[in-house]
């Protein structure tokens, strides 16, 4: 009669944690008698899985009845896998006796486990950046295993290419995890826009998970100011408005100054939205110009979004008062200037 | 192809410690004894230990008290911690890879670094 | 400890001609699988050890055919079929059926 021989049929088995993973093993022959073990590894640090003989081993179960007379199937089934179990798994006969003795050993199979990467967070930069500058964004994603894997950038649906990824550790472990840091560089249109982070991995099958950043968080779009002079409303009275464009965020408030003197501060509050998320705001101040014996320079100050205020100033003539309502000849706007009040 | 590479200072002082490392480079970690060996001037090969992957650790008897093998898989690399050292331990340590195919011993030391020379001296 | 004993512990050799070294173990290498864990390794000058034979007969990957590892249980026995020029250095054998892996003392191969 041949010798006994331990069949393990398959040299590497995947398996998605959490799931249950079956180890096969066959022996040729019910001679010599004695029972199967299973080790995880070889040598002697080798782990014991399973016992057939004795021993308590909750996650184990055997796929056949392996006490019957004549079975030869001894394949197990492990419950419950995690990435720690991955390692190559023999399947070992031994000779009974006192105490029973290694007789033959499976080729063994390696045992290999697919965990899904958690879900990318996206995170950008802890300060807002104004249109033209360069901002990094970062991407993780852990605890997937095996190590491959695959991550992309896009911004409103187009790919970027200037980012980094790193996939820790370098060497061999349980799971993985995945950093990645994209440049983006705004525009004065990036209020509305998204950066998605994309990560590909065996275990998502072919559908990539996704992080999102709304830019609205990132980018903060500086107003630009423009202060005009409205046809007169009244004898001696002039409107002056201060047109505030494409801000955002909406944070901001408005400072008159007659003469470099605070006449009023208000904060934008009925704002109106453009179509790229950007808002416009209006203040306007009616002058007294009888109230004045000099020219007046009228400044519209704006501080937006906690930044060192901007401004913009129209003079005010006031050496010949208007004549009749509607009239212009009186406050001719001559010239506008803008300078950073700190 | 795997490569070993031993990395540690020269020179130890009497009574300190004797620290090394061996990077893995081109391989995996898993399945295999991770051991260093050493080899005094003009003698033969003496075994100090070494570790498995599961983190299990083997000792040579006479240098156990001594000694300590720790791996770090996140970083590919095992190290050797060898405390109060004297003359005696002046040698070339190699680290190298034990294979284990099946069964309760081993396949071979198919793998050894190029070796790295300490010297015990004042 | 397993104690390994080699002879003879110096073999001058002729380049051509068939060289042999001798190994004995204070105990049986054969497993109850039997599996003989006995090794063989050369060390040339000024570099590091390298892997023959393992399992007592079975050649490492990119070692010489002229190489063959021989005998079972406590007594074994390396046999080079042509030394080449190439072939000299100490060889060492070694156990690894227990902790700890013990070497013999080593057999230095030069030419005559």
């Known amino acids: 009669e041949e010798e006994l021989q331990v069949i393990q049929p398959d040299k590497s088995v995947s398996v998605a944690a959490g799931e249950s993973a079956i180890l096969h093993c066959t022996v040729t022959s019910l001679i010599p008698v004695g029972p199967i073990q299973w080790f995880r590894g070889a040598g002697p640090a080798r782990e014991l899985i399973y016992n057939q003989k004795e021993g308590h081993f909750p996650r184990v179960t055997t796929v056949s009845e392996s006490t019957k007379r004549n079975n030869m199937d001894f394949s197990i089934s492990i419950s419950n896998i995690t990435p720690a179990d991955a390692g190559t798994y023999y399947c070992v006969k031994f000779r009974k006796g006192s105490p029973d003795t290694e007789f033959k050993s499976g080729a063994g199979t390696e045992l290999s486990v697919r965990a899904k990467p958690s879900a990318p967070v996206v995170s950008g930069p802890a300060a807002r950046a104004t249109p033209q500058h360069t901002v990094s964004f970062t991407c993780e994603s852990h605890g997937f295993s095996p190590r491959d894997i695959t991550l992309k950038w896009f911004k409103n649906g187009n790919e970027l290419s200037d980012f980094q990824t790193n996939v820790d550790p370098v060497g061999e472990s349980v799971s993985y995890s995945i950093h990645s840091t994209a440049k983006v560089v705004l525009t004065r249109e990036d209020v509305h826009s998204q950066v998605i982070c994309e990560v590909a991995h065996v275990t998502l099958q072919g559908d990539p998970l996704r992080g999102t950043a709304n830019l609205s968080e990132t980018i903060r779009v500086p107003p630009t100011l423009e202060v005009t002079q409205q046809p007169v409303r009244a004898e001696n009275q002039v409107n002056v408005t201060c047109q505030v464009r494409k801000f955002y965020p909406q944070r901001l408030q408005l400072t008159w100054l007659e003469n470099g003197n605070v006449s009023r501060t208000e904060t934008a509050s009925t704002v109106t939205e453009n179509k790229d998320g950007t808002y416009n705001w209006m203040s306007w101040l009616l002058v007294n110009v009888s109230a004045h014996r000099d020219d007046v320079k009228l400044t519209c100050q704006v501080e937006h979004d906690g930044q060192p205020a901007v401004s913009k100033s129209h003079d005010l003539k006031v050496s010949a008062h208007p004549k009749e309502q509607g009239s212009n000849t009186a406050a001719e706007n001559t010239g506008s200037n803008e300078r950073n009040i700190y | 192809q795997v490569q070993l590479q031993e990395s540690g200072p020269g020179l130890v002082k009497p009574s300190e410690t004797l620290s090394l490392t061996c990077t893995v480079s081109?391989?995996?970690?898993?399945?295999?004894?991770w051991s260093w060996i050493r080899q005094p001037p003009g003698k033969g090969l003496e075994w100090i230990g070494f570790?498995?992957?599961?983190?299990?650790?083997f000792y040579q008897s006479s240098l156990k008290s001594r000694v300590t093998i720790s791996l770090d898989t996140s970083k590919n690399q095992f190290s050797l911690k060898m405390t109060s050292v004297t003359a005696a331990d002046t040698a070339v340590y190699y680290c190298a890879r034990v294979r284990a195919y099946s069964g309760i011993g081993l396949d071979g030391t198919d793998v050894w670094g190029q070796g790295t020379t300490v010297t015990v001296s004042s | 400890d397993i104690v390994m004993t080699q002879s003879p512990l110096s073999l001058p050799v002729t380049p051509g001609e068939p060289a042999s070294i001798s190994c004995r173990s204070s105990?049986?290498?054969?497993?109850?699988?039997?599996?003989?864990?006995l090794d063989w390794y050369l060390q040339r000058p000024g570099q590091s050890p390298q892997l023959l034979i393992y399992g007592g007969s079975s050649r490492a990957s990119g070692v010489p055919d002229r190489f063959s590892g021989s005998g079972s249980g406590t007594d074994f026995t390396l046999k080079i079929s042509r030394v080449e020029a190439e072939d000299v250095g100490v060889f060492y054998c070694?156990?690894?059926?227990?902790?700890?892996?013990?070497f013999g003392q080593g057999t230095k191969v030069e030419i005559k």
């Open positions: 105990q049986s290498l054969l497993y109850s699988t039997g599996y003989t864990y």
């Open positions: 570790i498995y992957y599961n983190g299990r650790t």
């Open positions: 070694g156990q690894a059926l227990q902790t700890p892996l013990t």
């Open positions: 081109g391989g995996s970690i898993r399945d295999y004894y």
